[in-house]
């Protein structure tokens, strides 16, 4: 024999009250799947917790954090502090990367700048607390002579076309 | 161990204010979230206000905006919650409690210690 409840469908619930008809879900609760017995209270995203997306009655809302944090968690359940370009967060809070390491996000870890003569080449621009090294040309292909880099094409001055 | 002791309830008259505390202790107070959450009689948990660590971020429940400040010393250990323009309908039992991760801001369910709460009264 089939459960009455089954034909029930997302954004309702199976009504015991009322003979097992499907009934809508109340303001502010939601079902996400057909057969419920009960619809599940919305999430409200309050204080440093903006709504994303809000409820509707077949899917929970949504939040992210307010600016100056960051999500963590499944669902965005908890909302940890930014640092700086150029920082980590540490139990100590945000702190400046140290010599030789760098993070260009607001968030995260300061990561070791690359390394670059592990692949056999020098240091094109030299990295900063919120940037890494960039690698450029391997050494030998800088030796007299060689031409490692394409020189730029003279500028010319707006509205004059090339004689 | 962790404890946060609340202090500062008692009856006022509607209009009035009062300054509740909460002296922290067993934990490096500068490095957490803190809030404050209420509870009327007969009814279930409502979160009023956080705190971040530092304190310069603060965050209201919609009904205490514009009457209610959270504040904190980290130098004292303690959390403040300064109540003006107190209504009927903020009586209940205030907890101050503690956010799980250091410079993190959880939801309710995740607080990870609370205090027994004091009781504030607003009747005239």
């Known amino acids: 024999l089939q459960d009455p409840c089954s034909n029930c469908p997302a954004g309702t619930f199976c009504d015991n009250n009322r003979n097992q008809i499907c009934s809508p879900c109340p303001p502010n609760s939601f079902s996400s799947a057909g057969g419920q017995r009960t619809c599940d209270i919305c999430r409200q995203c309050k204080g440093v917790f903006r709504t994303r997306k809000e409820c509707s009655s077949t899917s929970n809302a949504e939040c992210d954090c307010t600016p100056g944090f960051h999500c963590l968690g499944a669902g965005c359940s908890m909302c940890e502090q930014d640092c700086k370009q150029g920082q980590e967060l540490t139990k100590k809070g945000c702190k400046d990367c140290c010599f030789g390491t760098f993070n260009d996000q607001k968030r995260g870890i300061c990561r070791p700048w690359t390394n670059c003569s592990l692949d056999g080449k020098s240091v094109l621009v030299n990295g900063t607390k919120e940037r890494d090294v960039v690698c450029g040309p391997s050494p030998a292909d800088l030796s007299p002579g060689a031409s490692s880099v394409t020189p730029p094409a003279p500028a010319r001055e707006p509205g004059h076309s090339p004689q | 161990q962790v404890q946060l002791v609340e202090s500062g309830g008692g009856l006022v008259q509607p209009g009035g204010s009062l300054r509740l505390s909460c002296s922290a202790s067993?934990?490096?107070?500068?490095?957490?979230?803190m809030s404050w959450v209420r509870q009327a009689p007969g009814k279930g948990l409502e979160w009023v206000s956080d705190i971040n660590s530092g304190g310069e971020s603060t965050f209201y429940e919609d009904s205490v905006k514009g009457r209610f400040t959270i504040s904190r010393d980290n130098a004292k250990n303690t959390l403040y919650l300064q109540m003006n323009s107190l209504r009927a309908e903020d009586t209940a039992v205030y907890y101050c409690?503690?956010?799980?991760?250091?410079?993190?801001?959880?939801?309710?369910?995740?607080?990870?210690?609370w205090g027994q709460g004091t009781l504030v009264t607003v009747s005239g």
């Open positions: 409690a503690k956010h799980p991760l250091t410079y993190t801001i959880a939801t309710m369910n995740d607080y990870d210690y």
């Open positions: 067993g934990f490096t107070f500068s490095s957490y979230a």
